[in-house]
């Protein structure tokens, strides 16, 4: 899908817009809000009834090169006694983010935007029970 | 994609860092993944820490629509279907990258922006602070 050119009345190209070759767009990868911090509650990944671990994926041809993925530790959820309760399910919560992919073609380099699905954490849900007829 | 010639030293002198500004293809890879979390799963309703999804729309951003989760309760839903405050519902937050039109209103010029979104909620044991 192309980046939407929203309503012509609003997006009349201002004089200040940089010239861009057809079929491409100019992307500044100096990130706005680069230094903002996530203010999540302390170690919720361990305190959750559906706890999870983190792994870091690394790819030098991706920007950002480091993407953190969560994996649920259990199939069930942890009950008040600290035991796994398999009548409930730990499930991953996912979110899309954008990355820039660098591709090498001979002695040339091209850049492609890519949507990546990140698993952010886990939540405990009541299972959907499918009864067999 | 748009090809950019590499340095004369190619293939030996590989630039490890990304340039500050790049030209990228208008087509986004993996673009067809579902962006409406209400359609992709019903976890928001079945969770013991259920959440509501709020639509955040900004035409100067891509994607222009982002769904923000807000925990429905301070406590978690127990086996009896009651809200139990011995446990706490908390949001799971994630930094994501989006595109911001820069300069504003330009159709094909963007800058990456990092934003913090609440993706869903999870049920945690609270940290209790007693007053001495």
């Amino acid at each position: 899908r192309k980046i939407p050119k929203v309503g012509h009345t609003f997006f009349q190209k201002p004089e200040s817009c940089p010239p861009v070759p057809g079929g491409s767009m100019k992307l500044d990868i100096g990130i706005i809000n680069e230094n903002q911090r996530v203010s999540m509650s302390r170690n919720i990944e361990s305190r959750s009834t559906s706890p999870w671990n983190y792994t870091v994926t690394w790819d030098p041809n991706r920007y950002p090169s480091e993407v953190v993925q969560a994996q649920c530790r259990n199939l069930g959820c942890i009950n008040a006694q600290g035991k796994e309760d398999i009548s409930m399910n730990s499930v991953p919560i996912q979110q899309e983010t954008l990355v820039v992919r660098r591709k090498h073609q001979g002695c040339s380099v091209s850049f492609q935007l890519e949507k990546v699905l990140v698993t952010v954490g886990c939540t405990c849900v009541t299972p959907v029970i499918h009864h067999v007829q | 994609g748009i090809t950019i010639p590499r340095n004369p030293g190619c293939p030996n002198s590989e630039d490890k860092n990304f340039p500050r500004t790049v030209m990228v293809n208008l087509n986004i890879h993996n673009r067809n993944t579902n962006t409406n979390p209400k359609r992709s799963s019903d976890y928001y309703n079945r969770s013991t820490s259920p959440w509501n999804l709020h639509r955040n729309e900004d035409p100067e951003r891509y994607p222009s629509v982002i769904w923000e989760a807000k925990c429905r309760h301070l406590g978690c839903i127990n086996a009896d279907g009651n809200v139990d405050y011995h446990m706490n519902s908390v949001p799971i937050q994630q930094e994501i990258l989006v595109l911001r039109r820069e300069p504003p209103h330009c159709p094909n010029s963007f800058r990456l922006e990092k934003i913090l979104v609440s993706v869903g909620c999870t049920c945690v044991t609270p940290i209790v602070h007693h007053v001495a």
Epitope: S39, S41, I44 | P50, N52, H54, K70, C71, R72, H73, L74, G75, I77, G81, N82, V83, Y85, N88, S89, V90, P91, V124, P126, I127, V128, H129, H130, V131
Partner: antibody, heavy 120, light 112 residues
């Protein structure tokens, strides 16, 4: 605009049960939680129970065995039942609303209250 | 249960004065989500309580800006910059971080 009105008996005999209805207008019970709070004459406020917009409930554990709460969204009514009343249950009983999408989990609008006296 | 201790219990003022009411909770009111669910209500004689301030410092709709709330953790304050006749009544602090939701005993703001 948001309005809540409590209705119930003025007088209840000791050991009997009390049923009070909160009828709301200007908003939907599918977006608001409803709390019940009581206030004995000349005293402070005591929170009893809440029924949230999704039908889930939270009780004051000190009174849970004597209380039950339910609602009918289509009639915009919330019902409180309290069993085994004693004289110290004499109080003004208020219902109060809590708008889900403010996420402040408190009582933003209150009814005018219904006065209940427990006496033989 | 979380005990809410209000001081003073009675506050005689003259119209136009500044008034300050304190409330202390027996445990922190910071929820695991980072928010503090502490609130102030005003109950005028013969009326039901009305919400003034929610989540420590947010004025509820229609509340004049002479009312301000502050504090964190366990210690909170309500200030009225210039008391008007319509401000007289009993002020209750309240918390909804923990169940049961609890209220302070009330502070009676009255004329000297």
């Amino acid at each position: 605009q948001v309005q809540l009105k409590e209705s119930g008996p003025d007088l209840v005999a000791p050991s009997q049960s009390l049923s009070i209805t909160c009828t709301v207008s200007g908003f939907s019970l599918t977006s608001y939680g409803i709390h019940w709070v009581r206030q004995p004459p000349g005293k402070g406020l005591e929170w009893l129970v809440v029924i949230w917009s999704d039908g889930t409930t939270t009780y004051n554990s000190a009174l849970k065995s004597r209380l039950s709460i339910s609602k009918d969204n289509s009639k915009s009514q919330v019902f409180l039942k309290m069993n085994s009343l004693q004289t110290d249950d004499t109080a003004m009983y208020y219902c109060a609303s809590s708008y889900d999408y403010l996420y402040h989990y408190t009582m933003d609008y209150w009814g005018q209250g219904t006065s209940v006296t427990v006496s033989s | 249960d979380v005990v809410m201790t209000q001081t003073p219990l009675s506050l005689p003022v003259s119209l136009g004065d500044q008034a300050s009411i304190s409330c202390r909770s027996s445990q922190s009111l910071v929820h695991s989500n980072g928010n503090t669910y502490f609130h102030w209500y005003l109950q005028k004689p013969g009326q039901s309580p009305k919400l003034l301030i929610y989540k420590v410092s947010n004025r509820f709709s229609g509340v004049p800006d002479r009312f301000s709330g502050s504090g964190s953790g366990t210690d909170f304050t309500l200030k009225i910059s210039r008391v008007e006749a319509e401000d007289l009544g009993v002020y209750f602090c309240s918390q909804s971080t923990h169940v049961p939701l609890t209220f302070g005993a009330g502070t009676n703001l009255e004329l000297k």
